[in-house]
């Protein structure tokens, strides 16, 4: 909320850099054809670019990404019986970020 | 994406804890009259609870929060009058988190 002037530190810009975020491993990511299963873990940490740039016309974007395969457990329920499987999910980590110009949207003709 | 089993580390759950997130200040301070000439900084870092819990019926929630006033500089131009403001924005940091039971939504009667 916006208040009157109190003892407040000057706000520091959240610079454009990688930060740890939580990525939800959705069931659709594992198997689109079957709904009768559970995934463990339900979410993992990833590194993602975030923050602000010096200008409204530029955005914090990744300049270097790395794909990281991780193993998740898939528990299928078949005729009330749990079947344990392992699946690989490829996560995308951002390694480096940069404030890059946002291409102006093309006018609709 | 789901790949075949490669050399993949077991996925680790993103535990319920505080992580650094980016909070956009400019949205808070944008007035409907569009009088803002300049708001600085446009975004700041905050600490927020995120991550997953062991069960779908519990959610990662803050158990302790702290309000942190920060000073934002702002130039508004209203009817040719430049108004130089130092506004205080109160940010909410999460200090501690816990997996808490989600109260079941009451049925609509």
């Amino acid at each position: 909320s916006l208040g009157s002037l109190t003892v407040a530190e000057p706000a520091m810009i959240a610079e454009c850099k990688t930060r740890t975020e939580v990525f939800e491993i959705s069931r659709r990511l594992i198997d689109r054809t079957n709904a009768n299963f559970l995934v463990w873990p339900p979410c993992v940490e990833v590194q993602r670019c975030s923050g602000c740039c010096n200008n409204r016309n530029v955005q914090c974007r990744p300049t270097q990404v790395q794909l990281r395969p991780v193993q998740v457990r898939k528990i299928e329920i078949v005729r009330k019986k749990p079947i344990f499987k392992k699946a690989t999910v490829t996560l995308e980590d951002h390694l480096a970020c940069k404030c890059e110009t946002v291409a102006a949207a093309r006018p609709v003709t | 994406s789901l790949g075949s089993l490669t050399v993949a580390e077991p996925a680790m759950i993103a535990e319920c804890k505080t992580r650094t997130e980016v909070f956009e200040i400019s949205r808070r301070l944008i007035d409907r009259t569009n009088a803002n000439f300049l708001v600085w900084p446009p975004c700041v870092e905050v600490q927020r609870c995120s991550g997953c819990c062991n069960n779908r019926n519990v959610q990662c929630r803050p158990t302790q929060v702290q309000l942190r006033p920060v000073q934002v500089r702002k130039i508004e131009i209203v009817r040719k009058k430049p108004i130089f403001k130092k506004a205080t924005v109160t940010l909410e940091d999460h200090l501690a988190c816990k997996c808490e039971t989600v109260a079941a939504a009451r049925p609509v009667t």
Partner: antibody, heavy 116, light 107 residues
Framework: QVQLVQSGTEVKKPGASVKVSCKAS????????ISWVRQAPGQGLEWMGW????????NYAQKFQDRVTMTTDTSTNTAYMELRGLKSDDTAVYFC?????????WGQGTLVTVSS | DIQMTQSPSSLSASVGDRVTITCQAS??????LNWYQQKPGKAPKLLIS???TLETGVPSRFSGSGSGTDFTFTISSLQPEDIAKYYC?????????FGPGTKVDIK
Amino acid sequence: QVQLVQSGTEVKKPGASVKVSCKASGYTYGAYAISWVRQAPGQGLEWMGWISAYNGNTNYAQKFQDRVTMTTDTSTNTAYMELRGLKSDDTAVYFCARAWNSFDYWGQGTLVTVSS
Amino acid sequence: DIQMTQSPSSLSASVGDRVTITCQASQDIRKNLNWYQQKPGKAPKLLISDASTLETGVPSRFSGSGSGTDFTFTISSLQPEDIAKYYCQQYYNLPFTFGPGTKVDIK
């Protein structure tokens, strides 16, 4: 330290345009506006307008409204002032200055001479 | 536009003298006034902001006062390096406007 470095002297013919640059360093460019002020030979200071380095918002003095365009390039931390339809009485030193509620740092000035 | 007037337009004083320049606004500008020093061939330099706040690194012999429409700029003990032109500037309304300046030199 804060520095504003301007482009060099320009000689232009009446009716032409001039574009003066102002490269900023030593501070967070987007956190301030850049003002442009001119000074005719032996005369006082005249404010032309300003631009927000963060979002490109501009505000021009009425006198220059139709002839001036101020722009900013944050990839190089550079502000530009273009003046069109030059006349002999536009001969002046053009200054850029870091602006908030005062002009606390100034460029060295760019002399623009308009002569046929 | 707000008109700014300064007096005197020029003055000569001896080293060590107290020098006073006045600046008048054509309407109430509260304390929204700055003072600048400009030496020949150089860019202006901010000395005082908000009518009376001395900028960092500016010698304490410079001071400013006033509010509303009448403002004063004082050099308590004139030094040879103070030879320059001094301008007041309002930031209460757009366009920002400067006074015509006061030229200070040594007798």
